[in-house]
């Protein structure tokens, strides 16, 4: 048999080999396609199938406008005047080339170290199903679930049966101050064998956030307190989303749930030590504050102030 690839909406003529050029002809066309459940023999007189397929005077079969449902097998059997039988067999596959792919909602800016949406690539009105691919600086991007992730969606038009493909690209750009990356998207058709078509490239800028600023504040100011007093330690780390705050004492992690505030009620000698907080941001990693010393006054000769990182300041900022 012969494989035929036909474009949806276009006419297709299948020749009945060996058929006399004009009537009278002894021939039979039958088809098994998406419109039939088994073999359908076409009436030579024509009829309600003519809008889909009908026999021309020369014995060929005309499909006036090929559709998805016309994919299948077409067979002609003809007997010439000498009684010799000739068979023709065609396997028809159909295709439709979609519009040029487009990147919708392209990002103008990405944030280094943070997963950012680059855009959504759309290919509309193709058949059969093709594939969308993303490229960065001309190289194929392979989703790894970490720095590069792709979310794909396929929809089929209820009336036409044509496909719409969507592919959303998320990347976590590296910092480093090099030139911003260039992204493009390509569509590769499932049929026929054709070169991929590409979108226009986009080049969002990459913003590099500075290091997380973690400040530790102590109340009462100074960090030197009388026994039985309450000390409040507050960790400030402005960022979105808010980071998780963990507490350290004398270099050891305190077994407490994450919280930006640490209360030390009714302090005693056991509470003395060096305190710091660690802010953990999902995209910037952990950052520790400068430490603060808490001292408990035990009498007139005892210490009168806490030392905070060797300075007498009540708050310390981490540059």
């Amino acid at each position: 048999g012969q494989n035929i690839t036909a474009r949806i909406g276009e006419p297709l003529v299948l020749k009945c080999k060996g058929a006399p050029k004009k009537p009278p002809q002894q021939l039979e066309w039958k088809l098994n396609t998406g419109r039939t459940e088994a073999w359908k023999v076409l009436s030579p007189q024509g009829g309600s199938w003519d809008s889909v397929a009908h026999v021309l005077p020369n014995g060929s079969l005309l499909l006036p406008a090929v559709g998805i449902q016309d994919e299948g097998t077409f067979r002609c059997r003809t007997t010439n005047r000498n009684g010799k039988e000739t068979k023709s067999n065609y396997r028809v596959r159909v295709y439709q080339i979609p519009g040029k792919p487009e990147i919708l909602d392209p990002a103008s800016e990405l944030t280094a170290g943070i997963p950012s949406k680059v855009g959504t690539c759309v290919s509309d009105g193709g058949y059969p199903l093709g594939t969308l691919s993303w490229h960065m600086d001309g190289k194929l991007l392979v989703p790894d679930g970490k720095g590069v992730s792709v979310k794909e969606q396929t929809r089929r038009h209820p009336d036409t049966g044509l496909f719409t493909l969507q592919s959303e690209l998320m990347v976590t750009p590296a910092g480093g101050g090099g030139p911003p990356p260039t992204f493009s998207c390509s569509f590769s058709p499932g049929l026929p064998r054709r070169r991929a078509s590409y979108t226009a490239p986009i080049q969002p800028s990459v913003w590099e956030p500075g290091p997380l600023e973690v400040r530790l504040l102590v109340e009462p100011e100074g960090g030197a307190v009388a026994p039985g007093e309450t000390v409040t330690l507050t960790c400030e780390a402005p960022a979105q989303p808010p980071p998780q705050i963990h507490w350290m004492k004398d270099g050891m992690s305190l077994p407490l749930p994450p919280s930006p505030v640490l209360l030390l009620p009714e302090v005693g000698p056991q509470d003395e030590g060096t305190y710091s907080c660690v802010a953990t941001h999902p995209n910037r990693g952990p950052q520790e504050s400068l430490p603060i010393s808490i001292s408990v006054e035990t009498g007139e000769d005892g210490p009168t102030a806490g030392s905070e990182g060797g300075s007498g300041l009540g708050t310390l900022a981490l540059a």
């Epitope: 309600s48 199938w49 809008s51």
Partner: antibody, heavy 119, light 107 residues
């Protein structure tokens, strides 16, 4: 909204002629096959004629072949049925319907026009 | 030519009844059968297309099924507005053929 409106029915003598019209609106007329169906008084439905969307191909049952001619004017969104050599058994309500090929069947019908063949 | 034998030719039923009408094709017509409803003095209205598909705006109590060359129209719970005549149509082969009709009357 799809609308089909028949006209041209009436009383005609046996052997006479009549031309029915069907005005179509609410859809792209030249995308569809069109059909005439009739119904004799108190009887069932009978297919009379079909025409493809271009007007190049026409189809009839033996009962009306060579007497009736279906045609269309896509520029005017109109379907016609020329009936010649009319007989008493042609007396019926004639309906215009959209479709007639395997992609549609008949999906919309007009309200019909009565043709009476009598002396 | 294909014959479409429709049965019964008439039936009496009450509101709420389940009603079944059958058409048998004399040869294979694939899925190419429609069902129509017709009320006195009105044009037919398509209920089911391609054997099993409900036409737009038709209540879901109507359904169509097919087994080989046997086609069935079912009304799951008859309503007062369903008393009418029902026709099947094969449109796979010319001449296109209607069934003889089934008149559904009030019991």
């Amino acid at each position: 909204e799809v609308q089909l409106v028949e006209s041209g029915g009436g009383l005609v003598q046996p052997g006479g002629s009549l031309r029915l019209s069907c005005a179509a609106s609410g859809f792209t007329f030249n995308n569809y096959w069109m059909t005439w169906v009739r119904q004799a008084p108190g009887k069932g439905l009978e297919w009379v004629a079909s025409i493809d969307n271009s007007g190049d191909n026409t189809y009839y049952p033996d009962s009306v072949k060579d007497r009736f001619t279906i045609s269309r004017d896509n520029a005017k969104n109109s379907l016609y049925l020329q009936m010649n050599s009319l007989r008493a058994e042609d007396t019926a309500v004639y309906y215009c319907a959209r479709g007639g090929d395997i992609t549609t069947g008949f999906d919309y019908w007009g309200q019909g026009t009565l043709v009476t063949v009598s002396s | 030519d294909i014959q479409m034998t429709q049965s019964p030719s008439s039936l009496s039923a009450s509101v709420g009844d389940r009603v079944t009408i059958t058409c048998r094709a004399s040869q294979d017509v694939g899925i190419y059968v429609n069902w129509f409803q017709q009320k006195p003095g009105k044009a037919p209205r398509r209920l089911i297309y391609r054997a099993t598909n409900l036409a737009d705006g038709v209540p879901s109590r109507f359904s169509g099924s097919r087994s080989g060359t046997d086609f069935t129209l079912t009304i799951s719970s008859l309503q007062p507005e369903d008393f009418a005549t029902y026709y099947c149509l094969e449109f796979d082969e010319h001449p296109l053929t209607f069934g003889g009709g089934t008149k559904v009357e009030i019991k």
